[in-house]
Interface confidence: low
Amino acid sequence: LMGGQDKPFLSARPSTVVPRGGHVALQCHYRRGFNNFMLYKEDRSHVPIFHGRIFQESFIMGPVTPAHAGTYRCRGSRPHSLTGWSAPSNPLVIMVTGNHRKPSLLAHPGPLLKSGETVILQCWSDVMFEHFFLHREGISEDPSRLVGQIHDGVSKANFSIGPLMPVLAGTYRCYGSVPHSPYQLSAPSDPLDIVITGLYEKPSLSAQPGPTVQAGENVTLSCSSWSSYDIYHLSREGEAHERRLRAVPKVNRTFQADFPLGPATHGGTYRCFGSFRALPCVWSNSSDPLLVSVTGNPSSSWPSPTEPSSKSGICRHLH
């Protein structure tokens, strides 16, 4: 990622998207190393700290304000040249978030998808945003940007993600920007986890004492596999949330998690998936569906002693 012969490469760590009040490190990489460099901002709202300043290796900028949003370039020190400085680097856009209220982010057809499928992430708001930005957690490259479309008092943009591969799984957030301030972004949307399934062999799902139980009888669903999954995820058809448990190695060399559902009040179709700690958003193929039937006096809900995970917590590690 080096620049051209006489062109430094300017980058930002951890990301070009910086929350208001946060910090960002700007690094100017020039001629096989970090040298003295100067930074400048390509607009009229000059951040005063740059005037006549020379930096070494990297410059930590912050706490950032909306005035820090914009395009930056650097020049590397080149003592024997006519000007003493290299050609300007690549432009680097720093976006500052937290300047407007957050938009909403939805996944169509849903956040749980098979490898190879495409998902549309729709970012929308009643704020008349001119542009929307989509950013994946942990990625330092610039977010994707789309022009907002306005309809019935709502501005929105549809981002197409796919065909889905493990590298695209993760936690997404979107932001909006208003006219005339393209790099002063809104607060982030609530995080949305995009999970890709179908990458590893399916686990097996069984019910104790069995798939048909009396109303009020305690039921446990066991998910197991020969694969050394770290986490199992249990989903019930028609429920937005999944439950997850750490896998436990068993004497028979399988890896298993037991989901206690409590006293049976209502049946349903269940599936489970396995995943590894290193890639929490990449799941196995689904187990065969398991239909749990309740005889006697079914009611409309099933208590869950294991708290369902939030829709945005799937891609975090289980501690």
Epitope: Q149, H151, N158, S160
Partner: antibody
Framework: QVQLVQSGAEVKKPGASVKVSCKAS????????MHWVRQAPGQGLEWIGY????????ENNRKFKDKTTMTADTSTSTAYMELSSLRSEDTAVYYC?????????????WGQGTTVTVSS | DIQMTQSPSSLSASVGDRVTITCRAS??????LAWYQQKPGKAPKLLLY???NLADGVPSRFSGSGSGTDYTLTISSLQPEDFATYYC?????????FGQGTKLEIK
């Protein structure tokens, strides 16, 4: 069906102004941005700018910033582009185009074009 | 501003030929790209959007590919009505520049 119908050809003298219209039908005018594109004789396409009819917000290509003024009349679903201080190099076909919706939207509908000739 | 460089600028081919036109952006445009066909005296007509998606009513012999900075329009088997000028256009922030065009002529 969606239609964008533009005003007829114009012949103007250098220094004059001209106002080109683009009447939209078949969709909700305020729900889509309207863009203008220029094509000089024998040349390629150049994006001039756009107007958001619901807010009146406009954005111009810097090249045309002092040349064009874009407006919209929501009561008649008509977008306008006025070209001022005309010169011979402004001779071109001017198109209006609607920016679509959905996945990475393109210009999905175009007007038939309005020829503006600047000649003394 | 983002520059769009189309190649070739002109191309002679015969009915039935497979033809490829390329478009290179001066920076990553993340598939925010459309292709248009224009015939003399007519407005441009949308062929593909989002780099690879066929617009309504466009024959399947047209296809698009690419990502990042490099994109391609392919016509798998040229028909007489395909002889026209083709333009790419990016939507990665304003100004939405077009390629300079590729004129496809009958050999």
């Amino acid at each position: 069906q969606v239609q964008l119908v533009q005003s007829g050809a114009e012949v103007k003298k250098p220094g004059a102004s001209v106002k080109v219209s683009c009447k939209a039908s078949g969709y909700t005018f305020t729900s889509y941005t309207m863009h203008w594109v220029r094509q000089a004789p024998g040349q390629g396409l150049e994006w001039i700018g756009y107007i958001n009819p619901s807010s009146g917000y406009t954005e111009n290509n810097r090249k045309f910033k002092d040349k064009t003024t874009m407006t919209a009349d929501t009561s008649t679903s008509t977008a306008y582009m006025e070209l001022s201080s005309l010169r011979s190099e402004d001779t071109a076909v001017y198109y209006c185009a609607r920016l679509g919706k959905g996945l990475l939207p393109p210009f999905d509908y175009w007007g038939q074009g309005t020829t503006v000739t600047v000649s003394s | 501003d983002i520059q769009m460089t189309q190649s070739p600028s002109s191309l002679s081919a015969s009915v039935g030929d497979r033809v490829t036109i390329t478009c290179r952006a001066s920076e990553n445009i993340y598939s925010n790209l459309a292709w248009y066909q224009q015939k003399p005296g007519k407005a441009p007509k949308l062929l593909l959007y989002a780099a690879t998606n066929l617009a309504d009513g466009v024959p399947s012999r047209f296809s698009g590919s690419g990502s990042g900075t490099d994109y391609t329009l392919t016509i798998s088997s040229l028909q007489p009505e395909d002889f026209a000028t083709y333009y790419c256009q990016h939507f990665w922030g304003t100004p939405y520049t077009f390629g300079q065009g590729t004129k496809l002529e009958i050999k």
